[in-house]
Interface confidence: low
């Protein structure tokens, strides 16, 4: 499974969208967990509503929010007020009893906010949201613009 690397600015929001086969994962709750080390366990951060039909409702744990569009097959996780300590390897999971199937591995990188940096124009932040297979990151600036950028390059 490919690891998608997403970058976000400190103090801002990062939105990750993990896509999945809606039929295959019918009735399953989703979770967002943080992997402890490369081979370590994945520590649950937040999971979708206990009642699958209410999975579209946002569930929050601290600054992390999850919601699942079960018809579209997209679970969305938002990391609010991103901090350096949020950097690390995460997983989107589909839960089936005690088992968890990995939908997407996501490496979150946190960069300092370069809005005041004269060189910031070189940072690749397109003006329109772009989607791609697997995961998508959206970066909303303090200027109330919504922009997005793909895995870093």
């Amino acid at each position: 499974l490919n690891t998608t690397v997403l970058q976000g600015m400190a103090g801002q929001s990062l939105r990750v969208s993990c896509t999945y086969d809606a039929l295959k994962h019918w009735g399953r709750r989703k979770a967002w967990c943080r992997q402890l080390g490369e081979e370590g366990p994945c520590q649950r951060v937040v999971s979708t509503h206990g009642v699958w039909l209410l999975a579209f409702l946002k569930k929050r744990n601290g600054s992390t929010v999850i919601a699942d569009d079960t018809l579209a097959g997209t679970v969305t996780i938002t990391l609010k007020n991103l901090q350096a300590g949020d950097a690390g390897l995460y997983q989107c999971q589909s839960l089936r009893g005690r088992e968890a199937e990995v939908l997407q591995k996501v490496l979150v990188e946190v960069l300092e906010d370069p809005l005041d940096d004269q060189d910031a124009g070189d940072l690749w932040v397109p003006e329109e949201s772009s989607s791609f297979e697997g995961a998508q990151v959206e970066h909303s600036t303090s200027r109330n613009q919504e922009t997005s950028f793909p895995p870093t390059s």
């Epitope: 690397v5 950097a87 990188e109 940096d117 070189d122 940072l123 791609f132 297979e133 895995p151 390059s153």
Partner: antibody
Framework: QVQLVQSGAEVKKPGASVKVSCKAS????????MHWVRQAPGQGLEWMGI????????TYAQKFQGRVTMTRDTSTSTVYMELSSLRSEDTAVYYC?????????WGQGTTVTVSS | EIVLTQSPATLSLSPGERATLSCRAS??????LAWYQQKPGQAPRLLIY???NRATGIPARFSGSGSGTDFTLTISSLEPEDFAVYYC?????????FGGGTKVEIK
């Protein structure tokens, strides 16, 4: 202006290690990832991996996993790429590259020759 | 990993002619594809990013198109300084990969 200056050419014996440096200037060092790309003589470009200078986290191409180590020194705005267990196929020009609009700034390249 | 296949391997043209270079990805890379130019002894130079956007300072004769798996770099009228090797590169997923290159040589 934004600049990446790499260390000089190296000649190494098979089995040895090489450490190439890339000093950044003209921008906020911790705000941009750094890539390493190599090019063997007469061959194409090959991506080796990436380092986040802010936290030091890395992601390496599977081909180099276990042989490559990328580090950084924020006090000198320098990133390093160390490649161990060198073999003749590692003879190449090694570039550091800073992503902006894709890889928009490159170092001048460091030639590493592996020969017995 | 995503494999990028460039064609042709060599393109022999005269100054003033139109050059069309192709890059095909083994799976969709959306529009996250860049084109580079490299001359002997020099580092690669970014021409096009995100499939169709010209990088700063790149002449209008260079244009890129495509999305998904098929991409094209077009040089509308070759100048003497355009004879070089051209690489495509995807950054949709790690590992980042490059095509094998197309050499544009003087006929």
């Amino acid at each position: 202006q934004v600049q990446l200056v790499q260390s000089g050419a190296e000649v190494k014996k098979p089995g040895a290690s090489v450490k190439v440096s890339c000093k950044a200037s003209g921008y906020t060092f911790t705000s941009y990832y750094m890539h390493w790309v190599r090019q063997a003589p007469g061959q194409g470009l090959e991506w080796m991996g990436i380092i986040n200078p802010s936290g030091g986290s890395t992601t390496y191409a599977q081909k180099f996993q276990g042989r490559v180590t990328m580090t950084r020194d924020t006090s000198t705005s320098t990133v390093y790429m160390e490649l161990s267990s060198l073999r003749s196929e590692d003879t190449a020009v090694y570039y550091c590259a800073r992503p902006g609009k894709s890889m928009d700034v490159w170092g001048q390249g460091t030639t590493v020759t592996v020969s017995s | 990993e995503i494999v990028l296949t460039q064609s042709p391997a060599t393109l022999s043209l005269s100054p003033g002619e139109r050059a069309t270079l192709s890059c095909r990805a083994s799976q969709s890379v959306s529009s996250y594809l860049a084109w580079y130019q490299q001359k002997p002894g020099q580092a690669p130079r970014l021409l096009i990013y995100d499939a169709s956007n010209r990088a700063t300072g790149i002449p209008a004769r260079f244009s890129g198109s495509g999305s998904g798996t098929d991409f094209t770099l077009t040089i509308s009228s070759l100048e003497p300084e355009d004879f070089a090797v051209y690489y495509c590169q995807q950054r949709s997923h790690f590992p980042i990969t490059f095509g094998g290159g197309t050499k544009v040589e003087i006929k």
